[in-house]
Interface confidence: low
């Protein structure tokens, strides 16, 4: 299944040779990503990232998804994507609409994870998963 409606080709992984990201954060395309080793609900994950001066990851390009999939091993990680039931659509936490494919959809699964499959997976917001936080590189 096509995960994104449109694929933006031509992005390449940028490696960090300076101190652009804090320790234990991963650098990619001028952004820093933190992959937690603990779990919590989606709301707690959002607060966890906020406490680190970041947000849950907005995985809005195929390249970004591939980069994160390559480093998530096979764990499930919450990302900043939630289902707005009244609109019947998925939105990123920056309020932009996600028109791609989310698998495992269920009326009780209003949050999304990546990392255990090659797709975005709907998940219960109340089950504890790891989380991916994202912020600007310095």
């Amino acid at each position: 299944p096509q995960i994104f409606n449109k694929s933006n080709d031509g992005f390449t992984t940028t490696r960090s040779y300076g101190t652009v990201c804090p320790k234990d954060w991963e650098f990619y395309q001028a952004r820093c990503f933190f992959l937690s080793t603990s779990e919590s609900s989606w709301n707690e994950s959002r607060d966890f990232c906020k406490g680190k001066g970041s947000t849950l990851a907005i995985v809005n390009t195929p390249e970004k998804l591939k980069f994160l999939q390559d480093i998530t091993d096979a764990e499930k990680y919450f990302i900043g994507l939630i289902y707005h039931r009244e609109e019947k659509r998925w939105r990123w936490i920056n309020n932009s609409v996600f028109n791609g494919n989310v698998t495992n959809q269920n009326q009780n699964f209003n949050c999304a994870t990546i990392g255990l499959t090659k797709t975005f997976d709907a998940a219960s917001c109340d089950i504890s998963y790891r989380r991916i936080c994202e912020k600007n590189a310095k």
């Epitope: 779990e39 091993d73 699964f109 255990l116 998940a123 219960s124 089950i127 790891r130």
Partner: antibody, heavy 124, light 112 residues
Framework: EQQLVESGGGLVKPGGSLRLSCAAS?????????MCWVRQAPGKCLEWIGC????????YYASWAKGRFTISKDSAKNSVYLQMNSLRAEDTAVYFC????????????????WGPGTLVTVSS | DIQMTQSPSSLSASVGDRVTITCQAS????????LAWFQQKPGKPPKLLIY???TLASGVPSRFSGSGSGTDFTLTISSLQPEDVATYYC????????????FGCGTKVEIK
Amino acid sequence: EQQLVESGGGLVKPGGSLRLSCAASGFSFSRSSYMCWVRQAPGKCLEWIGCLSVGDGHTYYASWAKGRFTISKDSAKNSVYLQMNSLRAEDTAVYFCARAPSYSGDGGHGYDLWGPGTLVTVSS
Amino acid sequence: DIQMTQSPSSLSASVGDRVTITCQASESVDRNNRLAWFQQKPGKPPKLLIYTTSTLASGVPSRFSGSGSGTDFTLTISSLQPEDVATYYCAGYRGAHTDGDAFGCGTKVEIK
């Protein structure tokens, strides 16, 4: 006391099917991240079959088990199941149910609770 | 699938000896060194000894220790005791992308 108890083993003819059950007690079944099945042929190695994420029902399997073996759950009964189809003589083994409390948390990987096992014999 | 190779397949040592068992993965286990060690006695299910390479499971004596990373791991019994007679298994975790877990074929430990 936390425990897992397997049942449903026995003698089955080649080509037959069997459904094993694993009943959990003494702990909150819904909060254990994964329930897994592992088997051991007489005098042989442990062999991983597959796991089920109790939280959302996601399953994954060893490549050799895909298609023939299916793991499912019944949260109301605090149980997980292993459906085995097209059984062969080489499937003869003790089948263990095991809990992996969290693959994703700080506890890391490790089957911390095992059932005593149930013997499956495939023979004509 | 990932494959775990243990060595030796069996060993005999004296009480008080230091015993080392190695486990080699065919490919790197995940970035959190998700490798576990189990002890199994005849007729019993395996018992978790060590998880995430070096963390001792609850109630496991401190004479057991684990180390390693990537593809090479070690279980050490610093001073072998009679109750340690058993078969020891390693298990590596790669997750759903690569067909999950795999166990080594065991190392049988006996007393001389």
